[in-house]
Interface confidence: medium
């Protein structure tokens, strides 16, 4: 049974031209995290194996880094960036989670972003 | 029941350096992180290892911390050289969840670098 669930930045929004980390969070299980993959709409982005390390798409290494931890850094950011980012977590025994992020970004020098996680 | 627990914590001359340690017991995991929490600041990440060995590390730690699991023992260590003042903190290993939040955290443990 899965029993976790998946919390995420949410929807954020960031200046173009700057740099955004996109950030999910398994709890509510012990599940084994075999890998997350890092999509955005249809194209893959970035994997994080946990026995292989990351390995960032060709088409995106120049703009894409890896982390903090398990999330992903956009930079240099354009007004085509703007859309859906998926999180999945591949885990053992439990299955698939994913979560999703709407990032919008703006050609304002005002950009609110979303709230980060709070540590208890 | 997951627990986490820290030791190695102390206090050390600035330029010097400690060996932190956290024994899972419980359940391991794929990902392991070191964070810290200097008095009045927010808890940072600090470097995470996945169970191949891979790692990555904060900037601020980058060239001067090591961070290494032993898979047998179902512990992950961080070698901390070259101590600043700065990285004096309560250093918390957890199970990675994402670089800021975790869900099973350890108790922590007190590192002072002064001189």
């Known amino acids: 049974m899965m029993t976790g669930t998946i919390e995420t930045t949410g929807n954020i929004s960031a200046e173009k031209g700057g740099s955004i980390i996109l950030q999910c969070h398994l709890s509510s299980t012990t599940a084994q995290v075999t890998q997350v993959n890092w999509e955005q709409q249809d194209q893959l982005l970035a994997i994080c194996n946990a026995d292989l390390g990351w390995h960032i798409s060709p088409s995106f290494k120049d703009r894409v880094a890896p982390g903090p931890g398990l999330g992903l850094t956009l930079q240099s950011l354009t007004v085509n960036d703007t859309g859906e980012y998926f999180c999945i977590y591949h885990t053992y025994p439990d299955g698939t989670y994913t979560g999703r992020i709407f990032l919008e970004v703006l050609e304002s020098s005002v950009a609110e972003h979303g709230a980060r996680f709070q540590i208890p | 029941e997951v627990q986490l627990v820290e030791s190695g914590g102390g206090l050390v001359q600035p330029g010097g350096s400690l060996r932190l340690s956290c024994a899972a017991s419980?359940?391991?995991?794929?990902?392991m992180g070191w964070f810290r929490q200097a008095p009045g600041k927010e808890r940072e990440w600090v470097a995470s290892?996945?169970?191949?060995?891979?790692?990555w590390y904060a900037d601020s730690v980058k060239g001067r911390f090591t961070i290494s699991a032993d898979n047998s023992k179902n512990t992950a260590y961080l070698q901390m050289n070259s101590l600043k003042p700065e990285d004096t903190a309560v250093y918390y290993c957890a199970r990675e969840g994402s670089g800021y939040a975790s869900d099973y955290w350890g108790q922590g443990t007190l590192v002072t670098v002064s001189s």
């Open positions: 419980g359940r391991t995991f794929s990902f």
């Open positions: 290892v996945l169970r191949g060995g891979y790692t």
